[in-house]
Interface confidence: low
């Protein structure tokens, strides 16, 4: 192992260094040679250099004192080399109104101080983007703020006091967007202990899709350093990063339609929230509206969802049909509604968890039923589940990655429907992909609104 000859390091420091590089820089320890002390080049040295370069240290490739000091500094638990929801180039929130909920409160601070720190942290990002954040106290929020210690159900256990302070997941459903704070830290409103506001600004950056910055002045730099919260400002690098994802505060063109305005059907940027067949018709859902396309007829009509189904909400997120039963399932957040023969069934909505989804799944992006073998595919973030409609249970071995099993599709989709006995039509933003599930490949790329003769 490349040790500085003037530095006498204990074995546990060497192991600590390996663990740190494994956790934050993707070092694969099982690929290191058995004779570590004779190891002269490549893997370990490269990872040390990568870390030194990223964190602005002198690049020596040695586990020197300053490198070990940096390794011991309190920091965010998100890797600097990204395997944690793959944030760079990864998902963003596709809406500008984002909800958050504080799941539980640290006993270290007054509840009001926690509320204030989290609200101000969100405000830091809303000040430089078109994003608007609102706190909700019940129900499913986009971003869940959690205080937890040790192993807490996400395969990224905390490590006691010091070390990892917090971590957060990039945008997405379920655990996506959630920010977790290590309860073994002492959370404060000031410079003592760990400042909740500063840590939250950083973690919310991840929740919005930012990765770590190598600029030591950036709030997205991996390690924690207290700065005066009264004069705190985002660095130019932070602002550049977040505006590359969401634009500046004046950029409202990507905001969802106000509830009262009908989306322009032939807008080349039009995307849909959900699409499904209903008999010989295709329903396209968007905000509070749906378009009805009758097969083989060019004419289409727009309707309010509430005009057909007054008890249903706007913003349907997923839909699928089981034609043989005359049933349509509609999904929003963690609930679903059953429509039979175009009439809403009583005793709905019900929880999506009755399908057998794990608790971290909080919404469905898209769903499609394949009558060839009676399975429904549920698409959630970059994964999908397969549900056996006959046995009313999830098939084993799921979820799976969309990109792995639907060639050319993903990583996320907005909507999908099944047609012509062999095609799935996947919708991603303003694009649509005709996918032949017998050949298992895309056979056509279209605009999402191609069904309307645009």
């Amino acid at each position: 192992l490349p040790l500085n000859s003037s530095t006498s390091l204990e074995k546990n420091n060497v192991l600590f260094g390996e663990r740190y590089l494994e956790k934050f820089y993707g070092l694969e320890i099982n690929k290191l040679p058995v004779t570590k002390m004779k190891y002269s080049g490549n893997l370990m040295k490269e990872k040390i250099q990568e870390m030194q370069h990223f964190l602005g240290l002198k690049v020596t490739g040695q586990l020197d004192t300053s490198t070990l000091e940096m390794m011991h500094a309190p920091r965010c638990g998100v890797p600097d080399v990204h395997h944690f929801r793959e944030m760079p180039g990864g998902p963003v929130w596709r809406k500008h109104y984002i909800t958050y909920r504080i799941n539980n409160y640290t006993p270290d601070m007054n509840r009001e101080d926690v509320d204030y720190a989290i609200r101000k942290a969100f405000q830091v990002w809303s000040n430089v983007t078109p994003l608007k954040f609102s706190k909700i106290n019940t129900g499913m929020a986009d971003i869940l703020v959690v205080f937890a210690r040790g192993a807490h159900g996400d395969f990224h256990a905390f490590d006691g006091k010091g070390g990892i302070l917090a971590h957060a997941f990039g945008p997405g459903s379920g655990i996506g967007g959630d920010a977790h704070f290590d309860e073994d830290e002492f959370w404060t409103t000031h410079s003592g202990g760990t400042n909740l506001f500063l840590t939250a600004v950083h973690e919310i950056g991840h929740s919005l899709g930012l990765g770590h910055s190598s600029d030591p002045k950036a709030v997205m730099f991996p390690t924690y350093k207290y700065v005066d919260i009264n004069t705190f400002r985002l660095s130019a690098d932070d602002i550049r990063g977040i505006q590359s994802l969401y634009g500046d505060p004046k950029e409202n063109q990507r905001l969802p339609n106000p509830d009262n305005s009908e989306p322009a059907l032939c807008d080349p940027n039009l995307s849909f929230d959900a699409v499904t067949t209903v008999g010989n018709k295709i329903f396209f859902f968007k905000d509070r509206f749906f378009w009805l396309k009758v097969s083989e007829r060019p004419k289409t009509s727009v309707n309010l969802i509430s005009s057909l189904w007054p008890t249903l909400p706007s913003g349907i997120e997923a839909a699928y049909e089981i034609e043989a039963r005359n049933q349509v399932f509609l999904f929003k957040d963690d609930k679903y509604w059953l429509i039979s023969n175009l009439r809403p069934e009583p005793n709905y909505p019900k929880s999506i968890h009755s399908f057998g989804f794990p608790n971290f799944v909080k919404k469905i992006d898209a769903a499609v039923f394949n009558p060839r073998f009676y399975r429904t595919y549920f698409f959630v973030d970059n994964q999908y589940w397969r549900y056996d409609e006959r046995r009313q249970m999830m098939d084993p071995g799921y979820p799976k990655l969309i990109t792995k099993n639907f060639q050319g599709i993903g990583p996320k989709i907005d909507a999908v429907f099944y047609s012509k006995n062999k095609y799935y039509y996947f919708f991603q933003g303003s694009n649509q992909f005709e996918y032949d599930f017998l050949l298992q490949r895309i056979t056509k790329t279209l605009k999402s609104n191609s069904w309307f003769g645009c």
Partner: antibody, heavy 136, light 110 residues
Framework: EVQLVESGGGLVQPGGSLRLSCAAS????????MHWVRQAPGKGLEWVAS????????YYADSVKGRFTISADTSKNTAYLQMNSLRAEDTAVYYC?????????????????????????????WGQGTLVTVSS | DIQMTQSPSSLSASVGDRVTITCRAS??????VAWYQQKPGKAPKLLIY???SLYSGVPSRFSGSRSGTDFTLTISSLQPEDFATYYC????????????FGQGTKVEIK
């Protein structure tokens, strides 16, 4: 105990019709694929049709499409094969069979579940067969 | 259509012999291949499913394997009650027809 009992076979003239029944016991036919397979005298096995009763979904071999209809009455736990426009080449012993997938324990399903195929159409229980003779 | 070409069509063997029967699929059928045993005047019995999974109650001398589009049924030590006709069967949700059988292999006493 799972049991399948076919009935309804017999001698029929070309162009005639017959209705075969398959009475199931020991399991709920609603949630199983049911298959009809035939075997001409001295020949091999030939799949004829399949149904998944709770959906009413049906599949047919090209050789019988448009002439045969598979159906099920879940209240009677019975599957049927309605055979119209019968031809000499339809002469065979007709077996009804249940699909294996229904009987796989959940643990076993994990091992055999594939991305696109979950042990489709494998017949674990068969009836004794009923002979259909089409002759003038 | 997916064809299943079974070979040999018949074979003679003695008790204790190792017997191998092969089925070749005309195209990829994943591993959804089953093997059945049929005795004269009786219904077929399931032996193997998913190419290599032994159906419950079937003696362990029966085994199945796959190599590409070739599927093999092996009887490691032939017993008197094993003299019968054996059929392979492919199945796919995606093929038309979804189920096809091989022509059969008759195993006779030498």
């Amino acid at each position: 105990e799972v049991q399948l009992v076919e009935s309804g076979g017999g001698l029929v003239q070309p162009g005639g019709s017959l209705r075969l029944s398959c009475a199931a016991s020991g399991f709920n036919l609603s949630y199983s694929y049911m298959h009809w397979v035939r075997q001409a005298p001295g020949k091999g096995l030939e799949w004829v049709a399949s149904i998944y009763p709770s959906y009413g979904s049906t599949y047919y071999a090209d050789s019988v499409k448009g002439r045969f209809t598979i159906s099920a009455d879940t209240s009677k736990n019975t599957a049927y094969l309605q055979m119209n426009s019968l031809r000499a080449e339809d002469t065979a012993v007709y077996y009804c069979a249940r699909d294996l997938e229904e009987s796989l324990p959940k643990r076993a399903r994990t091992a055999v579940s594939k991305e696109l195929e979950s042990v489709p159409y494998v017949m674990d229980y068969w009836g004794q067969g009923t002979l259909v003779t089409v002759s003038s | 259509d997916i064809q299943m070409t079974q070979s040999p069509s018949s074979l003679s063997a003695s008790v204790g012999d190792r017997v191998t029967i092969t089925c070749r699929a005309s195209q990829s059928v994943s591993s959804a291949v089953a093997w059945y045993q049929q005795k004269p005047g009786k219904a077929p019995k399931l032996l193997i499913y998913s190419a290599s999974s032994l159906y419950s109650g079937v003696p362990s001398r029966f085994s199945g394997s796959r190599s590409g589009t070739d599927f093999t049924l092996t009887i490691s030590s032939l017993q008197p009650e094993d003299f019968a006709t054996y059929y392979c069967q492919q199945s796919s949700h995606y093929a038309s027809p979804p189920i096809t059988f091989g022509q059969g292999t008759k195993v006779e006493i030498k």
